[in-house]
Structures are given as structure tokens and as C-alpha cells.
Interface confidence: low
């Protein structure tokens, strides 16, 4: 593992950088006096922008609104007004620009109708916004159009009467397929979920929804639920959260064949003010919130089994506000198995974890190098790092940016933090750590702006500031030496940063807009850094790097979820373009099964730095509900089950007493006689 | 070391205003926040505001809003308290301090660490 | 608001004594939001222990904060001479932030 810098290490300036930058550097001042602004990346690789800005006057009886549309095709470094391709028609930001999935091109506005329309209206490209046509919608739209991920034709919308709409050729014609929904969903293959209101309201429903479904875009449905509270979608599982029968209680069930056959989930029933949460999930499994009675602030993470059913209790006191309220739990995508998030300790202290191998174990965040501990620190010289994430961002708290990590630039983690017992509220500093999150390092001193250029071979970023700013800062060796470029004379009130998704780009654009007595003038400035990183790289500028390495000489280092991997990586010192088509090189080995590989199996759970499975003390000697498709089931476990995604082979497999958990099927909403076909007459 | 100084006594008149101010040395002045809290003769400490010498925000309490502006200057790394429309029940010891939780709450409050020596402004005809 | 009511209003004790200052608040207050402060006469306050519980940093360890909910104690275990002043509660767990009247722990 590559380990931080010496703080006195000698940052070489890069030769010219001031000349190269300020070539590549375009700005565009936006010729209108609009309140906001947003921008959309249209296509991948594509190098179109389209920006929109809003400019709204709220009068005594209607609101006069005026929007302007400007598109960029080299990454925005130059912009044309293409207003009159929208007839300069006013677009309602709320449904912001609905862009196409993948690089189809397609982009739908909607634009605000006066008040005694039919219904509303839309501006449609298929051609990277190049063009629009207007079309007029026999509804008014209740939320943003969605694309069907499998074929962008396809789009689905609510009407403010509760209509679902569907349009099988990209917004040209419409056809209502169902009243009374409450909520819709594409699923695989063009499957639309929804769920629908029975005799009220989906408010006064709620807990007596129907979840329905259709295959074929409305054509026939099928109801595969009933007593439903709510539903979504994670990686291949469908859940559904049931009322119970008895009381006013729900339970999670989860179908993995698009609701054909059910399985109750083992996970604990929630009453009416809790809350279930799908954290993340992918094809192997899912992590799950589920709620604390009473308005605790917190709950318990549990990760599942290959099917989604059996739940093995994964972290307490998971810091998760409200419904719809704010959890800092953070997928790290630049290393597989890594997450962070934080819990509210006993003391009502927020602190930081991390979970290196899917949600099995979580820690400590480690110390950074040469750092202090701050006043949260009852030892001044043990403490750990505490990221800010969505819930400090929501307290207000000086932290302009979330975690970052992308896929590409493998092990880089950025995010803002403080070093102490606990997150606390001074300012906070922005910490890096080039290998997953196990080391950290002090980045730059104060809350800053960040955003990973060239799959990691620059970092860019901004100080955060309520004054005018006009300094951009930027690193090539992974944010151990950092230049400064004073990108115009005139400072900006700075906004954002834009660089296109993916992290592949070389161009950021700093948008800001600059205010005189009376108008404000929004002004985006774009970098390009090719000419910085002159070369493409080569072979000698890339060295191998073992991910999860912990124990060098143990030849299980570097095992997670059963296999381990190698990586090339840009060396530090190499100022050298990886480029568009850069593609992470890695090795992976399957590694000896450990108990490490297991999780526990429903029933069971593992203590604090423990590696065996103990069984739940409060589920001995309980009868408990489970269903199996449906069915009843008697599980039988010896306690461990092997962890989704888990490749190991040979080595150990736990062994004990397999015992009979004796469950019984208690939920009707798996009645098969609640399941009936319908056709669309 | 780490201290807070602040500016002299004042007599004022009632209906004037006064400005305290409080300098802070030996730590970096935007990273907490600045309180603060007065006294009357023979009385117990009263909350007056706070402010973040981060970004500005204030937090005032609640009978002195309109009366009370706090501000910083993070040049000078020096806070300032302006009362205005003084009464007689304004004469007090007023304190400044530091303020870890800058006027906000993340779930834990540190207390007020380190104290000014306090200003004494006395509101008479 | 949140008041806080300290009592006793006044302590006499001995230099050697154990001291008991209870601080109680007219509703539930987070631990992690309530700090004491010590003041002697024509001093600023001085910081003793945050989060109900912790000694800041400098503060010797015979002073102690303990409690919960709307409940809060500072004991001092051995009473030093430079220990009688004028001792207040403050919390911040709802705006607008408030301090108790004070406990006058005096000498006997």
C-alpha cells in the first residue's frame, strides 16, 4: 500500500502549468439575469452539455416565468443559445431534463401550460438536443417522465388525477393504462410495477395497496399483492413491505422472479412509525435498514443471503433520521466490499464505520498520519476519523460535498472529516485515502469542492467560501501535492463544479455567476489539463497493487469475499494521461475458505471482533414465521451461510450441530388465490 | 496560548449604543465559533447569540433580536457584539467565548472552552 | 424555552467535603448537551465538564458530571479551597440556549 506523504515532502511545481492552463481555459458568460441554473450531461463520451436557466418573477395572481436553453458540444467550453428550439416557452425545473439512459441521445423537457390546458406539454430530442419537437400530453404530468432502462422508447409518467401513462414510441403518443396508481416502476425487460388504491386515496390506502404488474406495457396486468404498504426495487430482488393481519405492523417479503412466488423475509416487523430502508443492493444481495421504534434517529443494518430472505444483523445504532430523511451510508465504488457510514452512540455522538468486506465486519476509521485528535477526544492521542456525510450536509454543517469515489480511479476515497472521538461541528478538513478507505491522509486543510478528472490521474478542487473566489487547486499524484491556478481576474460567487459522469474527462467547468449593484451574471469557466498531462501513459508508468492488503506475509492477505485482487495503478510520480478509453487492469485469485466467508445464518450473529456465529439471544427457544415461496419451511442452519459474492474454494466449512429453527407460514398475503390475471379491456 | 481579549469599559447613555469587541489568538478563529453571554450585577449568565466565524451564521436569543448584530472580522481574527437602544437593564459584564458548536448542534456540545476577561458597559443617565 | 433549576441556591461545606450540585431541567435534555461552568468573584466562567459527563481539558479529576434526562449532578469528591465559587449548568440541546440561576458553594 502505497502510504501518505511526509508533511515536509518537497511539491515540485509542474514546468508551465500557469502558461498550458491558461490556454485551455474558456469562459462563457451567460447572456440573461436568471435566478438558478442546471446542467445535464446528454450521452456518454459525447461532449454535449445542455444548460437551462430559470428566471421567475412571482406576481400577485400568476407567476411570469422565463427559461433559457443553452447547449455545449465540446464539453463546455463554448455555448449556443438554442432557446427558440423550445419556441422560448417557459420549462418547469421541478421536472428537471429528463435525459435517456445509456447514450440514446433523448431528452424530454417539460414545459409549464397555462392554467385551463388539457394538459401538458413536452420538448422532445432524439438527437442529443440538436433538435426538439413540441408535443402537446392528453394529462398533466405528476413526476419527470421515465425511461424504461432496456429501450428508451418506452417511457412511463403519473398525471396529477393518478393515471399512469405509458408511450411505446418516446412521448409521440400516449395511452392511460391504469387509474388510481400510487406509484410506478420500470422493472427488467420492460416490466412496469405499480402499485394501486383500492376504494380512497393512496394516502388513506396505505397498507391496503395492490401492487400489480404488467409485462407487456399495459396490454394484461397481474396482481401479485395485496395489503401492500410500499414496494421498490434492489439489484434482481423485488420487495414489498405487507401489512400484518393481526395488528397495525408490516414485514418485508422479497420475490426474485418479478412477483411470481413470495418468501417472507427474516427480517423484524416495523409499526406504523417505523421505517424499512434499502440501503444498497446489487445481483448477490442487499443491505437493509430497518427502523428503531420511537423517534430514536437510528436502526439496525442487516445484510442478506443470496436470496434476499435470510438477514444476518450487520450494524447497531445505524445512524437513519426519518422516512426519506438522511443516513451517511456510502457505497465506496473504487473498491469492492467497501462502505461508510455512521451510528449514534449511547452518548448521542456520531461516529464514523467502515465495512471492508460487504457489511460482515465494520470498524474504526483509521487515524490519519501525523493528526491530532480534536476536543471530541477523551484520549488525546487514540481517537479515529469521522467522514461527513449526508446528515452533517442536512445540519447545515460546512461541508459542501459528500464522500466521493468513483469505479475508475481504483482505491481513491475524498471526504470531509474531523479526527476525534466523534464527528464533531468545527470546521472540517478534507481527508484522502488512495487505498479503500484503510489509510488515511490529510488532503487540504478546510472544506473544499472536489472532483476526480482521467480515472484519478488529476484531483481537482475549490475552497469552499462565502466570498468571491478565482483559485482552482489541482493534484496529479493522487492529493499529496497540490498547485494553484488562478483561473480568471475577476472572482466568481462560485456554484458548482461540472465535469461529465464517469470521471473519465479532462475538462472541469466552474460555474459562478458575478453580481454588480443590480444584475447577477451567471459565467462558467472550463479547463481543460490535456496539455498538463502532455504523454499518454505507458506500461512503466503503471505498478501493481494488491487491494485489501493488510498482513503482507500472510498468504491469505488481501482475501475479501473470497478471492483477492491485483491492480495496476498510475504510480504517483507518473504525470501521464490514462485517457478516454482507460480500462482498470486487475487480477483476481479465489482464495482458501475461511469462517470469514460466512456470514450468520438467520438466528445468529456475530459479537463485536468475534469471527464465530452466536446464536441471537433473543430468538432461543422461539417459535418464528417464515415462508419459503409460500410454503411452510422448517430451516434447518448450522449458523453460517455463505457470504453472497463469496468465491472461495476448499479450505474450511464451518461445522456443527444443524438445528431445526422450527418455523411456521403465517403470511396470507401469499394466498395464491390473491393472484389473478387481468386484461386491459 | 490560546485567549480572547476584550476591548475596555463603557458608560453609555440609554437609547446609545455600545460595540464590544473580542480578539482571538492562538488557534485558527474560523474553525469554532464565538458566544456571548452577559451578567448582571449580582445576577447569573444570560445567553446572548452566537456566531460561526466560519461563514457568518448567526444565532440570537430570542429577547434581543432587533436590539443585537454580531459579526466577525476574520482578517483580524476579531468578533463583535453591537447592542443598541441601551437600557439600564443592559448594564452588565459582557463576555465572549469560544464556541465549538459555532451556534449549531450536531448531536454534542463541547462548552465554552476559553473565556474574554469580560467588558463592563454601564447604561445611565 | 428549556429552564434549568439548580439547587441547592447556596452550599456550605468544609474544604475535604464531598459536594453534590443537582441541576434539573424543565424538559428531557440530550446528556451529550449539558456543560458546568465554575466562577469565582470579577472572573470569567471556566469551562468543567461537557456532555454531562467529560472534564475538559485542565479540569482535575475530583470533579465529576453525571445524569440524564432532566436530571443532571456535578460532585466535587474533596473540596480544595480554590474550589468555592458560584457553579452553573448550561444547556444546548434546544434553542435558545440557557443557563441555571447557579449554586453558591461557599465556605462553612
Known amino acids: 500500500r502505497r502510504g501518505a506523504p511526509a508533511e515536509d515532502q518537497d511539491c515540485g511545481r509542474l514546468p508551465d502549468f500557469i502558461a498550458k492552463l491558461t490556454n485551455n481555459t474558456h469562459q462563457h458568460v451567460f447572456d440573461d439575469l436568471s435566478g438558478s441554473v442546471s446542467l445535464s450531461w446528454v450521452g456518454d463520451s459525447t461532449g454535449v452539455i445542455l444548460v437551462l436557466t430559470t428566471f421567475q418573477v412571482p406576481l400577485v395572481i400568476v407567476s411570469f416565468g422565463q427559461s433559457k436553453l443553452y447547449r455545449s458540444e465540446d464539453y463546455g467550453k463554448n455555448f449556443k443559445d438554442i432557446t427558440n428550439l423550445i419556441n422560448n416557452t417557459f420549462i418547469r425545473t421541478e421536472f428537471g431534463m429528463a435525459i435517456g439512459p445509456e447514450n440514446s441521445g433523448k431528452v424530454i423537457l417539460t414545459a409549464e401550460v397555462s392554467g385551463g390546458s388539457r394538459g401538458g406539454r413536452v420538448f422532445r430530442s432524439s438527437d442529443f438536443a440538436k433538435n426538439f419537437v413540441q408535443t402537446d400530453l392528453p394529462f398533466h404530468p405528476l413526476t419527470q417522465m421515465m425511461y424504461s432502462p432496456q429501450n428508451s422508447d418506452y417511457l412511463l409518467a403519473l398525471s396529477t388525477e393518478n393515471g399512469l401513462w405509458v408511450s411505446k414510441n418516446f412521448g409521440e403518443k400516449w395511452e392511460e393504462i391504469h387509474k388510481a396508481v400510487c406509484l410506478a416502476k420500470w422493472g427488467p425487460n420492460n416490466i412496469i410495477f405499480f402499485t394501486t388504491h383500492v376504494n380512497g386515496s393512496c394516502k388513506a390506502d396505505l397498507g391496503a395497496l395492490e401492487l400489480w404488474r404488467t409485462s407487456d406495457l399495459g396490454k394484461t396486468f397481474k396482481t401479485i399483492g395485496v395489503k401492500i404498504y410500499s414496494f421498490g426495487l434492489g439489484g434482481r430482488f423485488l420487495f414489498a413491505s405487507v401489512m400484518a393481519d393481526k395488528d397495525t405492523t408490516r414485514r418485508i417479503h422479497v420475490s426474485t422472479d418479478q412477483g411470481d412466488t413470495w418468501s417472507m423475509a427474516q427480517l423484524p416487523s416495523v409499526g406504523q412509525e417505523q421505517f424499512y430502508s434499502i440501503l444498497a443492493a446489487n445481483e448477490d444481495m442487499v443491505f437493509m435498514h430497518v427502523d428503531e421504534p420511537g423517534d430514536t434517529g437510528f436502526g439496525t443494518i442487516f445484510t442478506s443471503d443470496d436470496r434476499g430472505i435470510v438477514y444476518s444483523k450487520s450494524l447497531d445504532r445505524h445512524l437513519y433520521t426519518t422516512t426519506g430523511g438522511e443516513t451517511d451510508f456510502t457505497n465506496v465504488t473504487s473498491l469492492r466490499g467497501v462502505y461508510i457510514t455512521s451510528t449514534l452512540s449511547e452518548d448521542n455522538s456520531i461516529q464514523s464505520m467502515i465495512t471492508f468486506d460487504q457489511g460482515g465486519r465494520w470498524e474504526h476509521l483509521r487515524k490519519p498520519e501525523n493528526s491530532k485528535c480534536d476536543a471530541t477526544a477523551k484520549n488525546k492521542n487514540e481517537c479515529s476519523l469521522h467522514i461527513h456525510a449526508s446528515y452533517s450536509i442536512s445540519q447545515k454543517l460546512n461541508v459542501p460535498m459528500a464522500p466521493l469515489s468513483e469505479p475508475n480511479a481504483v482505491g481513491i476515497v475524498i471526504a470531509h472529516g474531523s479526527v476525534g472521538d466523534a464527528i464533531s461541528v468545527m470546521v472540517p478538513d478534507v481527508y484522502i485515502s488512495d487505498d479503500g478507505g484503510y489509510s488515511w491522509a490529510k488532503m487540504l486543510e478546510g472544506p473544499h469542492y472536489y472532483t476526480i478528472l482521467d480515472s484519478g490521474g488529476i484531483i481537482v478542487a475549490i475552497e469552499h467560501s462565502n466570498r468571491p473566489i478565482n483559485v482552482i487547486k489541482f493534484s496529479t499524484d493522487e492529493g499529496q501535492c497540490w498547485q494553484s491556478y488562478v483561473f480568471t481576474q475577476e472572482p466568481i460567487y462560485f456554484t458548482g463544479l461540472a465535469s461529465e459522469p464517469g470521471a473519465r474527462s479532462m475538462n472541469i467547468s466552474i460555474w459562478g455567476f458575478t453580481e454588480s449593484f443590480i444584475t447577477r451574471q451567471w459565467v462558467s469557466y472550463t479547463v481543460d489539463f490535456k496539455d498538463i498531462l502532455e504523454r499518454n501513459c505507458e506500461e512503466d508508468d503503471y505498478t501493481t497493487w494488491l487491494a485489501h492488503s493488510t498482513d503482507p506475509g500472510d498468504y491469505k492477505d488481501g482475501c475479501i469475499l473470497g478471492y483477492k485482487e491485483q491492480f495496476l495503478r498510475l504510480r504517483k510520480s507518473s504525470v501521464c494521461q490514462n485517457g478516454r478509453d482507460y480500462v482498470v487492469a486487475k487480477q483476481p485469485s479465489v482464495c482458501p475458505c475461511s469462517l470469514e466467508d460466512f456470514l450468520c445464518d438467520f438466528g445468529y450473529f456475530r459479537p463485536e471482533n468475534a469471527s464465530e456465529c452466536v446464536e441471537q439471544p433473543e430468538l432461543k427457544g422461539h417459535e418464528l414465521e417464515f415462508c419459503l415461496y409460500g410454503k411452510e419451511e422448517h430451516l434447518t442452519t448450522n449458523g453460517y451461510r455463505k457470504i453472497p459474492g463469496d468465491k472461495c474454494q476448499g479450505g474450511m466449512n464451518p461445522a456443527r450441530e444443524v438445528k431445526d429453527l422450527k418455523k411456521k407460514c403465517t403470511s396470507n398475503f401469499l394466498n395464491p388465490t390473491k393472484q389473478n390475471s387481468k386484461s386491459n379491456s | 496560548q490560546v485567549q480572547l481579549v476584550q476591548s475596555g469599559a463603557e458608560v453609555k447613555k440609554p437609547g446609545a449604543s455600545v460595540k464590544v469587541s473580542c480578539k482571538a489568538s492562538?488557534?485558527?478563529?474560523?474553525?469554532?465559533?464565538i458566544s456571548w453571554v452577559r451578567q448582571a450585577p449580582g445576577q447569573g449568565l444570560e445567553w446572548m447569540g452566537s456566531i460561526s466565524a466560519y461563514n457568518g451564521n448567526t444565532n440570537y436569543a430570542q429577547k434581543l433580536q432587533g436590539r443585537v448584530t454580531m459579526t466577525t472580522d476574520t482578517s483580524t481574527s476579531t468578533a463583535y457584539m453591537e447592542l443598541r437602544s441601551l437600557r439600564s437593564d443592559d448594564t452588565a459584564v459582557y463576555y465572549c467565548?469560544?464556541?465549538?458548536?459555532?451556534?449549531?448542534?450536531?448531536?454534542?456540545?463541547?462548552?465554552?472552552?476559553?473565556w474574554g476577561q469580560g467588558t463592563t458597559v454601564t447604561v445611565s443617565s | 424555552e428549556i429552564v434549568l433549576t439548580q439547587s441547592p441556591g447556596t452550599l456550605s461545606l468544609s474544604p475535604g467535603e464531598r459536594a453534590t450540585l443537582s441541576c434539573r431541567a424543565s424538559q428531557s435534555v440530550r446528556s451529550s448537551y449539558l456543560a458546568w461552568y465554575q466562577q469565582k468573584p470579577g472572573q470569567a466562567p471556566r469551562l468543567l465538564i461537557y456532555?454531562?459527563?467529560s472534564r475538559a481539558t485542565g479540569i482535575p479529576d475530583r470533579f465529576s458530571g453525571s445524569g440524564s434526562g432532566t436530571d443532571f449532578t456535578l460532585t466535587i469528591s474533596r473540596l480544595e479551597p480554590e474550589d468555592f465559587a458560584v457553579y452553573y449548568c448550561?444547556?444546548?440541546?434546544?434553542?435558545?440556549?440557557?443557563f441555571g440561576g447557579g449554586t453558591k458553594v461557599e465556605i462553612k
Open positions: 467565548a469560544r464556541d465549538p458548536s459555532g451556534g449549531t448542534t450536531l448531536h454534542y456540545y463541547y462548552g465554552m472552552d476559553v
Open positions: 456532555g454531562a459527563s
Open positions: 448550561d444547556q444546548l440541546g434546544s434553542s435558545p440556549r440557557t
Open positions: 492562538g488557534y485558527t478563529f474560523t474553525s469554532y465559533g
